[in-house]
């Protein structure tokens, strides 16, 4: 047994990013345990991550069922073996997290992009559909399924040897950019999403360059 | 099969001890929670408390505080219940229940047989 | 606590009937429900989780649903093996508590 009284949860941020959504918080645990709930405005409560130590909950699979709506979480503390609480008889006590709308706020992954093609006068470049952990009918979405005309693309591209860049954007998920024949290009794709007023654009792709010669080496 | 067996029947004097066992085989041990759910005679089902096998952590209804401890040997796959200060109204049959993980529904899906536990003078 | 009002407490219906019985929670608790069996002796079994999930090897003449703070459950088509004491339990709110318990019994 002891006498450490409980304490509640604080700094609890959202974590999101795809839709894959974990509620963070503090402290680390001594002598109690945490019970994560999770509702929309107009919503039950539902407990998740039951009496647990960590300090981090997956939330996932109650955001997806709806990844418009606006949630709002709250961390109960409860004291764990003979420990005392410091809630008033009955009141347990827990601390509400900030409200979270997925679709507004998850963060967008870093785009991958899939192929590239150089002919002519035209570079072609085509940024991966990632899925997200949103289903519907059993079958994960993909964020062009869950965001529509929302999601664009944005590309930068410059010739190899050039610092001077140039952006294009797309509402669909490939490219088609003028070029010059016979020169190299190097690019990366941000995906935007056109509606958000924050948090709008996603990280940097991996940046790929075409190979338009080889040195006279052959390497 | 998966299966939870308990120690048997006691009979303790008012103020005592008792400590019930519940081992647990056909299953991994440590990847579910297991509570403490008693029954007076021909009354309904109390849930006592909960404990996590894998850390040890341990969370008790309030009406308990002070007063159980419960316990685990992951060596044994055994989870102990210890009730201390008896009293007529403790006695009971206490049972251990699995029941989900800090993911899954806290529902009971497997059962010890029981053990009464006689509280008299 | 979360208090748990089943009924009613007790009630007989003939084999083939079907048998309602009711869990009103004191407050919401989401579909986190669950629904146990007790014949005498013996400990309980689970029949239904989260509200309206059949247990596996569960028959399918029980059934579970709810509607707001109030959960059914229903065995459609009474069978002298399901006398026993029936019990709802939430786990939404520490602690999990259960229902008193309906006792059915066959005329």
């Known amino acids: 047994s002891g006498t450490t009284n409980t304490v509640a949860a604080y700094n609890l941020t959202w974590k999101s990013t795809n839709f894959k959504t974990i509620l963070e918080w503090e402290p680390k645990p001594v002598n109690q345990v945490y019970t994560v709930q999770i509702s929309t405005k107009s919503g039950d409560w539902k407990s998740k991550c039951f009496y647990t130590t960590d300090t981090e909950c997956d939330l996932t699979d109650e955001i997806v069922k709806d990844v418009k709506q606006t949630y709002l979480a709250r961390v109960f503390s409860y004291p764990a073996g003979n420990v005392e609480s410091t809630g008033s008889a009955g009141e347990p006590l827990y601390e509400n997290s900030p409200e979270f709308t997925p679709y507004l706020e998850t963060n967008i992954g870093q785009p991958v992009i899939q192929k590239y093609e150089q002919g002519g006068t035209k570079l072609k470049v085509t940024v991966k559909d990632s899925f997200t952990l949103v289903r519907k009918n059993g079958t994960f979405l993909t964020l062009r399924q869950v965001f529509g005309n929302d999601l664009g693309y944005i590309l930068t591209y410059r010739k190899d040897s050039s610092t001077g860049r140039k952006t294009n954007t797309t509402h669909t998920n490939e490219f088609l950019i003028d070029v010059e024949k016979g020169v190299s290009y190097c690019f990366f794709a941000q995906a935007v999403i056109f509606s958000r007023k924050t948090n709008h654009k996603s990280p940097e792709s991996i940046t790929k360059c075409t190979e338009q010669w080889k040195s006279v080496l052959g390497e | 099969q998966v299966q939870l067996v308990q120690s048997g029947a006691e009979v303790k004097k008012p103020g005592a001890s008792v400590k019930v066992s519940c081992k647990a085989s056909?299953?991994?041990?440590?990847?579910?929670?297991m509570h403490w759910v008693r029954q007076a005679p021909g009354q309904g089902l109390e849930w006592m408390g909960i404990?996590?096998?894998?850390?040890?952590?341990?969370v008790y209804a309030q009406k308990f505080q002070g007063r159980v401890t419960m316990t685990r040997d992951t060596s044994t796959s055994t989870v102990y219940m210890e009730l201390s200060s008896l009293r007529s109204e403790d006695t009971a049959v206490y049972y251990c229940?699995?029941?989900?993980?800090?993911?899954?529904?806290?529902?009971?899906?497997?059962w010890g047989q029981g053990t009464m536990v006689t509280v008299s003078s | 606590d979360i208090q748990m009002t089943q009924s009613p407490s007790s009630l007989s219906a003939s084999v083939g009937d079907r048998v309602t019985i009711t869990c009103q929670a004191s407050?919401?608790?989401?579909?986190?429900l669950n629904w146990y069996q007790q014949k005498p002796g013996k400990a309980p079994k689970l029949l239904i989780y989260?509200?309206?999930n059949l247990e596996t090897g569960v028959p399918s003449r029980f059934s579970g649903s709810r509607s707001g703070t109030d959960f059914t459950f229903t065995i459609s088509s009474l069978q002298p093996e399901d006398i026993a004491t029936y019990y709802c339990?939430?786990?939404?709110?520490?602690?999990?508590?259960f229902g008193g318990g309906t006792k059915v019994e066959i005329k």
């Open positions: 989260d509200a309206s």
């Open positions: 339990q939430q786990y939404n709110f520490h602690p999990l508590t």
């Open positions: 404990i996590n096998p894998s850390g040890g952590i341990t």
């Open positions: 407050q919401d608790i989401s579909n986190s």
């Open positions: 056909g299953y991994t041990f440590a990847n579910y929670y």
């Open positions: 229940a699995r029941g989900g993980s800090k993911v899954a529904a806290l529902a009971f899906d497997i």
